[in-house]
């Protein structure tokens, strides 16, 4: 099943997020992803946990998953590079780099997103955009078109409260509010964009969605700049 959903959001403006990727398994949407270089998509490591025997591809330039669009193109994956410290049973280091079979054809609907290299927390209350093709309600309805939601960043101390994530949020992770509007499992791998800069990647740990006491968890890309650079080099 697809890993992820945007709850309480709305349909995104078509092709206004040219960095947005759909990571697909055997032709079906599995996870979100973000184009960070001409030939590289960043996603979440857990996305490929159950994909050992399947064909992984990356869809770029899409708004609708099913409808023909001039900018849409499906790329094969040459190489999948999960973070070496990612493990199935933790949310830590949940990053994955996918090398496309060739450089993406760039244009207005396909363009890499600048990512944050300054390793400093995003200020609480900052409004950040999350987008994805995950299911849009608790009944499991899957959208055909890209959805998004604007969420405020939550301070780590609040996120780590015993009633919330109970100390699980390390300095390499960040949180965003989840009060009825939220990202969730299958938007995993998708981007958290603050002011035009990629700050976080949706983690793919199992978590109740849309509950304000269980904020959304995102991997801070700035904390992994050295690893990203080493893989892309």
């Amino acid at each position: 099943p697809p890993r992820g959903r945007i709850l309480g959001g709305r349909e995104a403006e078509a092709h206004a997020r040219p960095y947005m990727a759909s990571v697909q398994l055997n032709g079906a949407h599995l996870c979100g992803g973000v184009l960070v270089a001409e030939q590289w998509v960043l996603s979440a490591a857990h996305c490929l946990e159950d994909a050992a025997d399947g064909k992984v591809q990356v869809l770029l330039g899409a708004h609708s998953l099913s409808q023909p669009e001039p900018s849409k193109r499906l790329y094969d994956v040459l190489r999948a590079v999960p973070h070496p410290d990612s493990q199935p049973d933790t949310i830590d280091h949940d990053l994955l780099l996918l090398q496309l079979s060739e450089k993406a054809t760039l244009g207005p609907a396909v363009r890499p997103l600048p990512w944050q290299r300054v390793d400093r927390d995003v200020a609480p209350g900052t409004l950040c955009d999350v987008a994805g093709w995950g299911i849009v309600n608790h009944a499991g309805r899957r959208p055909d078109s890209l959805q998004h939601v604007l969420l405020p960043v939550l301070d780590r101390a609040t996120c780590n409260r015993r009633t919330h994530h109970d100390g699980a949020i390390t300095e390499r992770l960040m949180c965003a509010e989840s009060n009825r509007r939220d990202s969730c499992k299958g938007d995993s791998g998708g981007p958290l964009v603050c002011g035009g800069v990629l700050e976080g990647v949706v983690t793919s740990g199992s978590r109740v969605c849309g509950n304000r006491k269980k904020p959304g968890i995102y991997t801070r890309v700035a904390s992994y700049a050295a690893w990203i650079d080493s893989v892309l080099a």
């Epitope: 206004a16 600048p114 995003v122 200020a123 209350g125 998004h148 604007l150 002011g195 035009g196």
Partner: antibody, heavy 122, light 107 residues
């Protein structure tokens, strides 16, 4: 068309509280953040905080925590700001403004109320 | 907090002239900058968002530029309705802060 209509001027005594309203029309109220600003006579603008009517989520500038309380009434598409323990320093014009979305995560205050003047005097 | 330093504080100009107002952020704000015009006794009006994009209905004589920490608003062929105060404001993190303003008056 989008409009934010604020309540009229207020003359209040020191130590009292005042509640300012901002009635939205011409758009889906629960889809957009509402920000509040303060402007003292002849001065610049200060950001007080925001509220998201869809979830009642709020965030305050540290400087205004304990001074301002933001609420909404979804049924009337109205945002409110309660200012408490008023002093002469709170005499100002207060504005509400809608936060509009532009492209993927750029946003700006695209529509503003006309402002509400609050005068604190004994 | 991010400080926004706006200059000049005031400017006396004639109609038809070109003026440039600058705004310096105390750190990189990644083009998350808006410009507003405010007339006496009125509310601010959005002119420019994301540093360079004109808001709906804003005349093309207005233009925004800049990146990183340095931004500017340029008004060419100044019209009588352009007199008033101008403010920059950042959207990079919280709290949101405004510049102190630039008052444009008729020479």
């Amino acid at each position: 068309q989008v409009q934010l209509q604020q309540s009229g001027p207020e003359l209040v005594k020191p130590g009292a509280s005042v509640k300012i309203s901002c009635k939205a029309s011409g758009y889906t109220f629960t889809d957009y953040y509402i920000n509040w600003m303060k402007q003292r006579p002849g001065q610049g603008l200060e950001w007080i905080g925001w509220i998201f009517p869809g979830s009642d989520s709020t965030y305050y500038n540290e400087k205004f925590k304990g001074k301002a309380t933001l609420t909404v009434d979804k049924s009337s598409s109205t945002a409110y700001m309660l200012l408490s323990s008023l002093t002469s320093e709170d005499s100002a014009v207060y504005f509400c403004a809608r936060l509009g979305y532009y492209s993927h995560s750029y946003y700006a205050m695209d529509y503003w109320g006309q402002g509400t003047s609050v005068t604190v005097s004994s | 907090d991010i400080q926004m330093t706006q200059s000049p504080a005031s400017l006396s100009v004639s109609t038809g002239e070109t003026v440039t107002i600058t705004c310096r952020a105390s750190e990189n704000i990644y083009s998350n900058l808006a410009w507003f015009q405010q007339k006496q006794g009125k509310s601010p009006q959005l002119l420019v968002y994301a540093a360079t994009n004109l808001a709906d209905g804003v005349p093309s004589r207005f233009s925004g530029s800049g990146s990183g920490t340095q931004y500017s608003l340029k008004i060419t062929s100044l019209q009588s309705e352009d007199f008033g105060s101008y403010y920059c404001q950042h959207f990079w993190g919280t709290p949101l802060t405004f510049g102190a303003g630039t008052k444009l008056d008729l020479k």
